[in-house]
């Protein structure tokens, strides 16, 4: 049984799989940060995590997912003020009772410390210098990502 | 080149519903909100509200009673409808791209709402 | 009455600086680094100035620049031009996905 969360996330994410292929992302758009080879929009409005969700999707991007530690510090210094929190593309997921990534993998245990509860509509929210479970339905910020498309050096055979 | 174009009826009568729609070219509607906002004759700008293409809407409080935002990605429009309307809400209306909700890069040429009987 | 308050008026020679002050409330201007300015030529839509109280958009001249101490936010126009004469608003991000604007300034070229 996949609560509602769950399944706006699995929607979202076969509707975007189901878009047609288009050219890789050679620059980050107007607005957008680049951070490696990702761009990241901070959202300045607030939203609950679905409707953040959505609004990644709309922009065709995703809600940020971080590989590691090292991704989320480096996510976290560019987080301007330590008061706000953001929405990141992670929340518990009831039938596996766990918390899943929206790319349908799980979090490994190491890369984020979290405070607070996993428990069912509980979502991730990063903070300057935390990681926090939050009830979904709270209207906070959040961060979308699109990944660059690493531009590679052609080679010419000898002539 | 992003362009906007608001269009609709000038003269609205009082008590009535203000409709307005706003066409976006040169660019998707999708991946922006967007927002309204209105000018009376010889005054200051007012904020009306917005709406993301996800179709959540914010609205300034003063009117939210009153405001309703719509908008439809597949014409790349969207709508503004104010109810109930007096001659206070007689003025120029705008509608502008809205980033991140906190500015508008892109505004259209306005469009006069005259409310009169 | 407007959220923020602006000076109604504002006035310099060509060639000189000239200031416009915003001063709103730790609730709106000194809460958040969103305040943007917008300049309006009679007749025409308002022209998009300054965001995040200090950036600028591409094809704004650098003699526009924007600033911000504590609730007061401030549009500075140096070097000033003919064509700069117009009325000058700021706007701020208040919260809870609210926005609010100022009253304008109406900046005359001597």
């Known amino acids: 049984q996949k609560s509602s969360i769950e399944k706006c996330s699995v929607d979202i994410q076969q509707s975007r799989n189901k878009t047609t292929e288009r050219p890789g992302l050679l620059n980050c758009p107007i607005y957008w940060q680049q951070l490696r080879e990702k761009c990241l929009l901070f959202s300045h409005t607030v939203n609950p995590w679905n409707n953040s969700l959505a609004d990644c999707s709309t922009k065709e991007s995703s809600l940020l997912l971080i590989r590691d530690k090292d991704e989320l510090i480096h996510t976290q210094n560019l987080i301007r003020d330590k008061a706000i929190l953001f929405w990141i593309g992670l929340n518990f997921s009831l039938s596996e009772k766990n918390w899943k990534w929206i790319n349908g993998s799980f979090l490994n245990s190491n890369d984020l410390e979290i405070r607070g509860d996993a428990k069912e509509n509980s979502c991730i929210s990063i903070s300057q210098t935390s990681v926090y479970s939050e009830y979904c339905s709270t209207e906070i910020r959040w961060i979308c990502q699109k990944e660059l498309t690493p531009v590679r050096n052609k080679v010419y055979p000898d002539s | 080149q992003v362009q906007l174009q608001e269009s609709g009826p000038g003269l609205v009568k009082p008590s009535e519903t203000l409709s307005l729609t706003c066409t976006v070219s040169g660019d998707s509607i999708s991946s922006y909100y967007w927002s309204w906002i209105r000018q009376p004759a010889g005054k200051g700008l007012e904020w009306i509200g917005r709406?993301?293409?996800?179709?959540?809407?914010n609205y300034n409080p003063s009117l939210k009673s009153r405001v309703t935002m719509s908008v439809d990605t597949s014409k790349n429009q969207f709508s503004l409808k104010l109810n109930s309307v007096t001659a206070a809400d007689a003025a120029v209306y705008y509608c502008?791209?809205?980033?991140?909700?906190?500015?508008?890069?892109?505004w259209g040429q306005g469009f006069l709402v005259t409310v009169s009987s | 009455q407007s959220a923020l308050t602006q000076p109604p008026s504002a006035s310099g020679s060509p060639g000189q600086s000239v200031t416009i002050s915003c001063t709103g409330t730790s609730s709106d201007v000194g809460g958040h680094n969103y305040v943007s300015w917008y300049q309006q030529h009679p007749g025409k839509a308002p022209k998009f100035m300054i965001y995040e109280v200090t950036k600028r958009p591409s094809g704004v001249p650098d003699r526009f620049s924007g600033s911000k101490s504590g609730n007061t936010a401030s549009l500075t126009v140096s070097g000033l031009q003919a064509e700069d004469e117009a009325d000058y608003y700021c706007?701020?991000?208040?919260?809870?996905?609210?926005?609010?604007f100022g009253g304008g300034t109406k900046l005359t070229v001597l």
């Open positions: 709406i993301y293409t996800i179709g959540t809407t």
């Open positions: 502008a791209r809205d980033p991140l909700g906190t500015f508008f890069d892109y």
């Open positions: 706007s701020s991000y208040a919260g809870i996905n609210n926005l609010v």
